[in-house]
């Protein structure tokens, strides 16, 4: 009864197609698979950024796999062949591991890369990224931003840079078609006559960095002798009402401050007949139903009522 063995996959490699972190892992079938012609061979692939504690594991019947990585760090991967029990008279058989690594040879010292990179997707319409030059770099240093997401044929360079003292310190992106709910990859590299500049890589999803416009059309409606309904409208733009959370700040008679977070465009406030003045502001944020994170909008213009009897039916400003 000879022990059944299988070889690891051949030619295992990590290929960089130039997508700024979205890499291809590919391999060829193991040698000597002739004994298992009737078998569907599977492969277990484990991979991670170097320094990460956990491996990501997948099983596939294919000879390739694609995923996103942080190119600021190296990547390590390993793969082995799996023979299901049907191939081997009831015992599972796995090969030894084939291993590979990939990293971009870093140029320049870490301090030369851009600092404080910040990207905001304004109102789910306009992406703007800004950064500060690296520490100690000379004025002849210029930075260039490239980006890619699935759907683009190749990485694109920013065409509308924000400049300060002749240096690129930000990018206004064009309309980004079908770019949300997928990884968005950015590389900011640089050039200088004097010294090499370290590249920086960033990955995020656009729906998670949205800063909406503030709500508009704030109004008051008296619901009863002790209740006032505050209302507002969603800001103009592509974000649907179901995607908003709101934070309200209400001030009564310059003293009482009420803060509340709500999901709808209304809030009912308990008041007393003695209330002489009422002011409120609202801001908006994309909620957990539409994103994993977000940025609060600026506060709306303040809406106040004062000087008249608050028992009047409708109070509009």
């Amino acid at each position: 009864d000879t022990e059944i063995k299988v070889n690891p996959p051949q030619d295992f490699e990590i290929v960089d197609p130039g997508y700024l972190g979205y890499l291809y892992l590919q391999w060829q079938p193991p040698l000597s698979l002739d004994h298992f012609k009737e078998c569907t061979v599977e492969y277990e692939l484990k991979y991670r950024n170097i320094g990460s504690e956990t491996w990501k594991t997948i099983i596939t019947k294919n000879l390739h796999y694609k995923d996103g990585f942080d190119l600021n760090k190296g990547i390590e991967a390993k793969i082995h062949t799996l023979l299901p029990w049907q191939c081997t008279n009831g015992s599972e058989v796995q090969s030894s591991w084939a291993e590979t690594t990939y990293w971009i040879s870093p140029q320049g010292i870490p301090e030369t890369k851009v600092q404080d990179m910040d990207c905001v997707y304004y109102n789910w319409q306009y992406l703007l990224c800004s950064w500060k030059p690296g520490i100690g770099v000379l004025l002849d240093t210029n930075y260039n931003l490239f980006y890619w997401y699935e759907g683009l044929d190749h990485a694109l360079q920013c065409v509308d840079y924000i400049k300060a003292d002749g240096q690129n310190i930000g990018c206004r992106f064009p309309y980004l078609e079908a770019s949300d709910y997928k990884d968005f990859y950015i590389c900011v590299n640089g050039s200088s006559e004097n010294k090499p500049i370290r590249s920086s890589y960033f990955t995020f999803q656009l729906q998670n960095i949205v800063k909406p416009l503030p709500p508009v059309y704030l109004t008051f409606t008296r619901e009863s002798s002790c209740e006032i309904k505050l209302k507002w409208s969603i800001p103009l733009g592509p974000i649907p009402a179901r995607c908003f959370d709101y934070e309200i700040e209400i001030r009564e008679d310059d003293t009482t401050l009420v803060t509340a977070t709500v999901e709808n465009e209304t809030y009912t406030l308990k008041t007393t007949n003695e209330t002489r003045q009422l002011c409120f502001v609202v801001r908006s944020k994309v909620n957990i139903y539409c994103s994993d994170d977000g940025i609060w909008s600026e506060w709306s213009d303040k809406q106040c009522w004062e000087g008249e009897d608050l028992s009047k039916k409708t109070l509009l400003r």
């Epitope: 569907t40 594991t57 099983i59 596939t60 019947k61 796999y65 009831g90």
Partner: antibody, heavy 121, light 108 residues
Framework: EVQLLESGGGLVQPGGSLRLSCAAS????????MSWVRQAPGKGLEWVSS????????YYADSVKGRFTISRDNSKNTLYLQMNSLRAEDTAVYYC??????WGAGAFDYWGQGTLVTVSS | DIQMTQSPSTLSASVGDRVTITCRAS??????LAWYQQKPGKAPKLLIY???SLESGVPSRFSGSGSGTEFTLTISSLQPDDFATYYC??????????FGQGTKVEIK
Amino acid sequence: EVQLLESGGGLVQPGGSLRLSCAASGFTFGTIPMSWVRQAPGKGLEWVSSISGSAGSTYYADSVKGRFTISRDNSKNTLYLQMNSLRAEDTAVYYCAKVRYGWGAGAFDYWGQGTLVTVSS
Amino acid sequence: DIQMTQSPSTLSASVGDRVTITCRASQSISSWLAWYQQKPGKAPKLLIYDASSLESGVPSRFSGSGSGTEFTLTISSLQPDDFATYYCQQYDTYPPITFGQGTKVEIK
């Protein structure tokens, strides 16, 4: 005849734990990968976890990773799912399923009758 | 993750009708696709595996076709016992194993 019989479901509070069992018969249990699949009330099927025949490899859905543990006792022909830190969204009928062909998962050719797990305070 | 999208979500048909359900994968899954039938309160039942292979004991009016990203389940002549919900499932690459959202076949 292949049979899979789940047990261990019930009502549990959020944050609580439960251990599901699946007793298998009618096939050579120790060589075959097994899986857990769940179905929330009125919803579709959601794969939860799989384990290879030898128990050497385990796989989990992101939604349960770190909270659920799949295991098996081949001497008892039994599959287990230990569920910790339960949440309301874990409420579902849990099915154990036999893998037709493959290392860790594949098409599921036999299913148990299911056991209902309700997470509520 | 590979997403599976079924259409239609609901299908109204009569006994004797030819019924086709479509399943689309977000990336190629070769022929690693299964179809299941589920009736209310019951466990799913495997109908088709490897996109087109009929599971033992399943009536021959059920058939599967397709490869890559587009797949279909066809019931050549709908029988009273066939009113149920049908799910597709990929097992090309995992985790996760992913299912379509289901297609309910109801009486017209």
